[in-house]
Amino acid sequence: LPAQVAFTPYAPEPGSTCRLREYYDQTAQMCCSKCSPGQHAKVFCTKTSDTVCDSCEDSTYTQLWNWVPECLSCGSRCSSDQVETQACTREQNRICTCRPGWYCALSKQEGCRLCAPLRKCRPGFGVARPGTETSDVVCKPCAPGTFSNTTSSTDICRPHQICNVVAIPGNASMDAVCTSTSPTRSMAPGAVHLPQPVSTRSQHTQPTPEPSTAPSTSFLLPMGPSPPAEGSTGD
């Protein structure tokens, strides 16, 4: 014979637990119904009457099956540096995430409590590690043969252009300036080129066929010591 289905509230068998979507009420000593997401317990069960549930009020929610007497308050409205990625409903909390150009400096269970602007690498420095939702940009000084002339949270150090004839040698914050009208660009971004004597380079009349091994101009201007503060601007 099939086992008889017990309707809530019911006394559980000794040593057994209540079924899914039920809870054991310590006072009534009965298995009683939980309330569905979006609801809360308005009246707790007794030995003969089951839980009575009610809808969460505006700006409150319950996400799980529950027997709480009061719904949880939704978080406060998203701040100006945030976007609302999930609205407050009866079944879920509002989720605020950082808007583009910002990262989460202090997270909470879901979303972000405090956003901060992504660090901007100043000229002479490029992005070593891009920012993520939860981490700031890391800047690094541009290596010989590379430069960055922008204040940016996304720009990396780019290789200097390679000149047939150099007018102004490049440095960490400035590209090389060529006298010829057809400069070439290094194919290997960030590659560090070995310096070559200027005299051998100035005789070329054609672009270098293998730019990846072409000479760099960065040795002509000493970089000097890197300034402190990781080459960043902003907060």
């Epitope: 310590q26 006072t27 009534a28 317990a41 308005k42 009246v43 707790f44 007794t46 030995k47 003969t48 009457s49 009575v52 007497p69 009061e70």
Partner: antibody
Amino acid sequence: QVQLKESGPGILQPSQTLSLTCTFSGFSLSTYGVGVGWIRQPSGKGLEWLANIWWDDDKYYNPSLKNRLTISKDTSNNQVFLKITNVDTADTATYYCARIDGTRYFDYWGQGVMVSVSS
Amino acid sequence: DIVLTQSPPSLSASLGDKVTITCQTSQNINKFIAWYQQKPGKAPRQLIRYTSTLMSGTPSRFSGSGSGTDYSFSISNVESEDIATYYCLQYGNLWTFGRGTKLELK
């Protein structure tokens, strides 16, 4: 508005039965989720919960006094009763009745009635 | 039975002080704790339900917090009308009152 008022004998002798009545207005014990409870307080001491009764006649008693307590109700007359058998001087106290919210806390209280057990 | 340990039994405060009362339960009561204020010769008056929800008419200087077995009640800025005895009540497993904390003026 919700109001509760306790009444009792005032004085009684050891071994007698104490009968208390709580008469209330502003709510009904036929309303789903409503309960009434009894709490007492000996002079200069703390509060002690005694018993509760619910709209559906479910009853709960303080385990340490359970065999001496009986709670009942008269829904149509808005009354709840508490009987305590075999009283002694330790039962001398102010007795309060209180309404119980559906989520089980005491939200409205009567003014209390003083009961003295003395030989 | 759940045992409730309320402390301290008495408390002296100056006007404007912040005072805190704690209640510890012998088992988890799932935040089902209420706080009451009682003045001499009067019935208790409920201030807080479900750990931290202020009852209608309770001034915002009163607050409650806690979970599991540890709960607290605070008055942030004591006023003369707050001089009373305060009780915690657990209602997660039957009903038990704490022994009370008498708040006095220094």
